[in-house]
Amino acid sequence: LNTTVLQGMAGQSLRVSCTYDALKHWGRRKAWCRQLGEEGPCQRVVSTHGVWLLAFLKKRNGSTVIADDTLAGTVTITLKNLQAGDAGLYQCQSLRGREAEVLQKVLVEVLEDPLDDQDAGDLWVPEESSSFEGAQVEHSTSRNQETSFPPTS
């Protein structure tokens, strides 16, 4: 799997979208974890709701929020109020029992705001290594901007 490099401004929100095969991953919870070292374990940050029907509901751990659109096959992770300490290697995972399948590896880089409190607008562009592999990001100066998800049936 290629690693997608995503950059975000300190103090703002970074949104990561990992896409997956909705049929293949039907009924599976998704998780966002932080990799400890190059070959180290991936430490769970947050996972979607235990009731798969309710995977579209936002679940949070501190400033990290996850929600899964199981119909579209897109799990969205939002890192709010991005800090320098949030930089690092992460994974989107699909959980089946105790096993975790990696959907996407994401390297998060945190940039200091060069405009110093001025509105950065939509100037930010994600840098990608090799291929985007289904991961996308939205960068917004509005910290409250969230995605709505359709019903899961």
Partner: antibody
Framework: QVQLVQSGAEVKKPGASVKVSCKAS????????MHWVRQAPGQGLEWMGI????????SYAQKFQGRVTMTRDTSTSTVYMELSSLRSEDTAVYYC?????????????????WGKGTTVTVSS | EIVMTQSPATLSVSPGERATLSCRAS??????LAWYQQKPGQAPRLLIY???TRATGIPARFSGSGSGTEFTLTISSLQSEDFAVYYC????????FGGGTKVEIK
Amino acid sequence: QVQLVQSGAEVKKPGASVKVSCKASGYTFTSYYMHWVRQAPGQGLEWMGIINPSGGSTSYAQKFQGRVTMTRDTSTSTVYMELSSLRSEDTAVYYCARGPGYTTALDYYYMDVWGKGTTVTVSS
Amino acid sequence: EIVMTQSPATLSVSPGERATLSCRASQSVSSNLAWYQQKPGQAPRLLIYGASTRATGIPARFSGSGSGTEFTLTISSLQSEDFAVYYCQQLDDWFTFGGGTKVEIK
């Protein structure tokens, strides 16, 4: 106003099945999930499962897996909870409760409207 | 499964006094916690959700606080209609209720 009206009390023998209904009114039935929660005499509340009235998808607590079936009839805005292989410890009041809507990604969720409950007595 | 523990099991309070009920989760549930009131022979009634947001129509004397694993429901000045059983519920991962706290007249 939003209301959940449940079926009447039932007395069943061990091994039998019971089907409890919950008729919703005052809101768009297919826009909110429905939970079932039970309460044994003098005991606390126990979550049993959830149904999506729109598509009919369900998710059950592990304890009730294989014994409970939740269904819905969109034409009458009614959800049903059927519990089979009844035993004396299933004697309880069974509640339906409205869960989260899915028109928006919610920050927090809860069970905001409850039926009055249906008493199910299992006795030989 | 996340286990919810409420304390005390019974709280004896005089009308007009403050009541403080505690709820502890076996692991973090963020702020996905609700409080319900239940009177004998009645269904539970939603009081608080999101740990601290009052449900529609709930009087201001009811307030909730806490996040993670420790939560509190406070009734600032108990009225006669507040004597009941109170349950906390986590909705962060599946759904589990605490064992309840009975608030009785002292």
